[in-house]
């Protein structure tokens, strides 16, 4: 889980001739707001397809009135970020649509009128947790400057927000095979439960034993890159070990088609197939009207008889969004308690409960420990719908039936030897070291003739502590 964040820096006339008319006037003051729609992947998707990764609407910007005779400046923007939360893994590649809307504040009957000023779209690669990426997009004579990033919400970490960090249980170390979470060592990575060998960079799992691939990767362990064309591509040889190589540079690389247009190569150059409402060599010209049918899912289009006066969609029940493209997600209210899975069946909501919970909304907590026994003096602890045993010293495993090896985590520093003991463990330190865990060198200078060791980092036993 995490949040995609969009920061709009400016919206105003683009460079070049043909400055756009100001969207507001003294007679009709107005203010701007923005809408972002995110879809996973780089695949071609119709404009009608839902914002599967999520959507967000900004606040309204300050009221703006055009100064007579002055060119249209950068328009005043709303405060704050547009934030789109995502519940699952961040896909790594995504498509976006950013719409600039104006709200006219005249004396219209029925309150303010909304109209679409500009719509830009694109497809990008982005790793979660990285820095802000800056972008400039043009729609007709307008130019939009913005930055975006994806960040994970705790306890998720990693480029796809699929690794988990949990507070550590032992005071001085993480368990066997688990790494500490940067920057402070008070948390450890949760145990990875994906299929053995699943690529940590390109694969993820949400249930034990599975290996699901991020966009652009395939194979049972997500180690094979997906070719953007076929293996017979004239610019990229195939490889038996890694699958098809991504083709070399071509006229469509970087997608010269704006606003979600799809690019196809021609013998000499490229050709853009533009989505509804855009035209021009690179789909850079926008002029959406009701004649273009911009309202999806049976929405009623009002206004916008010509390109200079935009439209508004009145959505049927069950749909929302500026183009009625988004199904109302009744599950977004999270009606299922205790981690239950919400299913919107159209005619009704259904909750699929996790083990240990029951009821229409999973509101009843069953007794996890009923009839469960922990061996070797362990005690049963309820929680999360699955019983857990708190084991006595020297035992481990789900039911405390396994004899724990206190030396498995390599608890002795600086090459000390670990010996299991009835009361825990004992470290036999290498010469020159002391302490219960051999962590203190007796004479750190060794044979050095320097009067004092230099400050800062000294590798003691630099292999990672597993």
């Amino acid at each position: 889980a995490g949040v995609f964040e969009l920061q709009i820096h400016s919206f105003g006339p683009g460079p070049g001739p043909g400055a756009p008319r100001s969207p507001c006037s003294a007679r009709l003051p107005c203010r701007l707001f923005f809408r972002v729609c995110l879809k996973p992947g780089l695949s071609e998707e119709a404009a009608e397809s839902p914002c599967a990764l999520g959507a967000a609407l900004s606040a309204r910007g300050p009221v703006y009135t055009e100064q007579p005779g002055a060119p249209a400046p950068d328009l005043p923007l709303p405060d704050g970020l547009l934030q789109v939360p995502f519940r699952d893994a961040w896909p790594g590649t995504f498509s976006f649509i950013i719409e600039t809307w104006r709200e006219e504040l005249g004396d219209q009957i029925g309150g303010p009128a909304w109209s679409l000023l500009a719509r830009v779209a694109g497809r990008r690669r982005l790793a979660a947790g990285g820095p802000w990426a800056r972008d400039i997009q043009r729609a007709g004579a307008w130019e939009l400057r913005f930055s975006y990033r994806a960040r994970c919400e705790p306890p998720a970490v990693g480029t796809a927000c699929t690794r988990l960090c949990r507070p550590r249980s032992a005071p001085s170390r993480c368990g066997p095979g688990l790494r500490p979470c940067a920057p402070l060592e008070d948390e450890c990575e949760a145990p990875l439960v994906c299929r053995a060998g699943c690529s940590p960079e390109h694969g993820f799992c949400e249930q034990p034993g599975e290996c699901r691939c991020l966009e652009g990767w395939t194979g049972p362990l997500c180690t094979v890159p997906v070719s953007t064309s076929s293996c017979l591509s004239p610019r990229g040889p195939s490889s038996a070990t890694t699958g098809c190589l991504v083709p070399g540079p071509g006229p469509c690389d970087g997608n010269p088609c704006a606003n979600g247009g799809s690019c196809s190569e021609t013998p000499r150059s490229f050709e853009c197939t533009c989505p509804r409402g855009f035209y021009g060599l690179r789909c850079e010209v926008s002029g959406v009207t009701c004649a273009d049918g911009p309202c999806f899912n049976g929405g009623l289009c009002v206004g916008g008889a010509d390109p200079d006066s935009a439209y508004i969609c009145h959505c049927p029940p069950g749909f929302q969004g500026s183009n009625c493209e988004k199904r109302v997600d009744r599950c977004s209210l999270q009606p299922c308690r205790n981690g239950g899975l919400c299913l919107d069946l159209g005619h009704a909501l259904r909750c699929r409960c996790r083990a240990g919970f029951a009821g229409p909304r999973c509101e009843h907590d069953l007794d996890d420990c009923a009839g469960r026994a922990c061996a070797n003096g362990g005690t049963c602890v309820e929680g999360g719908g699955a019983h857990r045993c708190s084991c006595a010293l020297g035992f481990g495993g789900r039911d405390c039936r396994e004899r724990a090896d206190p030396c498995a985590a390599r608890p002795c520093a600086h090459g000390g030897r670990c010996y299991a003991h009835f009361s825990g463990l004992v470290c036999a330190c290498a010469p020159g070291y002391m302490g219960a865990r051999c962590e203190f060198p007796v004479h750190p200078d060794g044979a050095s003739a320097l009067p004092a060791a230099p400050p800062g980092l000294r590798p003691g036993d630099p292999q990672r502590y597993l």
């Epitope: 005071p171 001085s172 219960a436 865990r437 962590e439 630099p462």
Partner: nanobody
Framework: EVQLVESGGGLVQPGGSLTLSCAAS????????MAWYRQAPGKKRELVAG???????GYIDSVKGRFTISRDNAKNSVYLQMNSLRAEDTAVYYC???????????WGQGTLVTVSS
């Protein structure tokens, strides 16, 4: 990276007291094993007192009963309380940390303690 900054050194008369402080950043002291070392002119650096990540402490024989090592998790610091100081305690005192997560050791710059009448 863990950074250690010592303070509290100075000139003190025999039989007097001093408290040295070591402030850590980059990790929490409760996840480090930390110690005080000292180096007298012309001698090797030697371990004086240590406190493990689990809170257990240890001292060399010559300072037992006079020196006390302690840790304050809230201030992310380790201290060395030195009582009944002697001339032979004169040295540069260094703070040391062993980071279990990475198995690296870290040193501070040192603070000078002079015991003289």
């Amino acid at each position: 990276e863990v950074q250690l900054v010592e303070s509290g050194g100075g000139l003190v008369q025999p039989g007097g007291s001093l408290t040295l402080s070591c402030a850590a950043s980059g990790s929490r002291v409760s996840f480090l094993s930390m110690a005080w070392y000292r180096q007298a002119p012309g001698k090797k650096r030697e371990l004086v007192a240590g406190i493990s990540a689990d809170g257990s402490t240890g001292y060399i024989d010559s300072v037992k009963g006079r020196f006390t090592i302690s840790r304050d998790n809230a201030k992310n610091s380790v201290y060395l309380q030195m009582n009944s100081l002697r001339a032979e305690d004169t040295a540069v005192y260094y703070c040391y940390a062993y980071r279990w997560a990475t198995r690296y050791t870290y040193w501070g710059q040192g603070t000078l303690v002079t015991v003289s009448s």
